[in-house]
Interface confidence: low
């Protein structure tokens, strides 16, 4: 599918919160959304409110995921399931790459070779059938402020 | 076991309409993401069509889109394929197959086929 | 969409290995673990062989083998028997959520 207009990223430093984003994956065209109840998925309707992210660098190169709404941050579980937890944990944490392509990449800190992704079905996909070169894995930040 | 039965296929006339069904049996089929793949006789295989274990997203191959429609009835564990405006080009043979889990592009449980013969 | 490259025959005797190559794109082989094999033996459906590349459905013999260097996939058969004798193609996902496959590549046993 067409990329949907206004991407933009790009590192920030340490503990700086930047504005709300939509992180658009280019598997299918699905938002990244966090539920309340903490599952993680994808929807492709931009005006859910569960797609509001708040990205927070812990340090260059790694922030953390937290769904405005649902007010938890996106975790890699150690069997590869992507769920939302109340509180920040080592598990919440995920390199942020800029690729050629102009798309990130968020890989898990805890589990280094596991991606956030999303299959072309809007579910998530298992960290443990992620890679490097896959098109789930890739994400385009987009503003949320509207 | 673990089954694909196509049904539906014949003969119709360039610019006809025929509607191919697959029911599956032994497996749980509301579980699976599901496709359509043909075999002109004598040719190679081609992806026709993917719709998700839900049904809410939908592919085509460029050769289909706008003539072919692909449902699925997760209560009677079938799936279906409306072809339109049907071109000689389409006479083949069509599989349903099953995708495997957590994949893309892997079909592990196919049909047998059905006959699709467009001619005047 | 386009189809993956592969040779139109191959033949090896009973005993032996044979190598059949998929050339595609970045757009598809290239650019994603996805590639599969499938088996056809003549009049019936196919047969999932190799997935991700590399990976063997249960009940495939290990015989069978897959790999892939840029955007060239190869199938590897080893101690080839009278019952591989077939038709194989090659498959792909590729960057437009479709899969494609190439034209097979017909195996002789001598």
């Known amino acids: 599918p067409a990329l949907p207009e206004d991407g933009g990223s790009g590192a920030f430093p340490p503990g700086h919160f930047k504005d709300p984003k939509r992180l658009y994956c280019k598997n299918g065209g699905f938002f990244l959304r966090i539920h309340p109840d903490g599952r993680v998925d994808g929807v492709r309707e931009k005006s859910d409110p569960h797609i509001k992210l708040q990205l927070q660098a812990e340090e260059r190169g790694v922030v953390s995921i937290k769904g405005v709404c649902a007010n938890r941050y996106l975790a890699m579980k150690e069997d590869g399931r992507l769920l939302a937890s109340k509180c920040v944990t080592d598990e919440c944490f995920f390199f942020e790459r800029l690729e050629s392509n102009n798309y990130n990449t968020y890989r898990s800190r805890k589990y280094t070779s596991w991606y956030v992704a999303l299959k072309r079905t809007g579910q998530y996909k298992l960290g443990s059938k992620t890679g490097p070169g896959q098109k789930a894995i890739l994400f385009l930040p987009m503003s949320a402020k509207s | 076991q673990v089954q694909l039965q196509e049904s539906g296929g014949g003969l119709v006339q360039p610019g006809g309409s025929l509607r191919l069904s697959c029911a599956a049996s032994g497996f749980t089929f509301s579980s699976y993401e599901m496709n359509w793949v043909r075999q002109a006789p004598g040719k190679c295989l081609e992806w026709v069509s993917y719709?998700?274990?839900?049904?809410?997203?939908?592919y085509y191959a460029d050769s289909v889109k706008g003539r072919f429609t692909i449902s699925r009835d997760n209560a009677k564990n079938s799936l279906y394929l409306q072809m339109n405006s049907l071109r000689a080009e389409d006479t083949a043979v069509y599989y349903c197959a099953r995708e495997l889990t957590g994949d893309w592009g892997a079909f592990d449980i196919w049909g047998q086929g059905t006959m699709v013969t467009v001619s005047s | 969409q386009s189809v993956l490259t592969q040779p139109a025959s191959v033949s090896g005797s009973p005993g032996q290995s044979i190598t059949i190559s998929c050339t595609g794109t970045?757009?598809?082989?290239?650019?994603?673990?996805?590639v599969s094999w499938y088996q056809q033996h003549p009049g019936k459906a196919p047969k999932l062989m190799i997935y991700?590349?590399?990976n063997r459905p249960s009940g495939v013999s290990n015989r069978f083998s897959g790999s892939k260097s840029g955007n060239t996939a190869s199938l590897t058969i080893s101690g080839l028997q009278a019952e591989d004798e077939a038709d194989y193609y090659c498959?792909?996902?590729?960057?437009?959520?479709?899969?494609?496959f190439g034209c097979g590549t017909k195996l002789t046993v001598l």
């Open positions: 719709i998700s274990s839900s049904g809410s997203t939908i």
């Open positions: 991700d590349v590399s």
């Open positions: 498959s792909s996902y590729t960057s437009s959520s479709t899969v494609v």
């Open positions: 970045s757009s598809d082989v290239g650019g994603y673990n996805y």
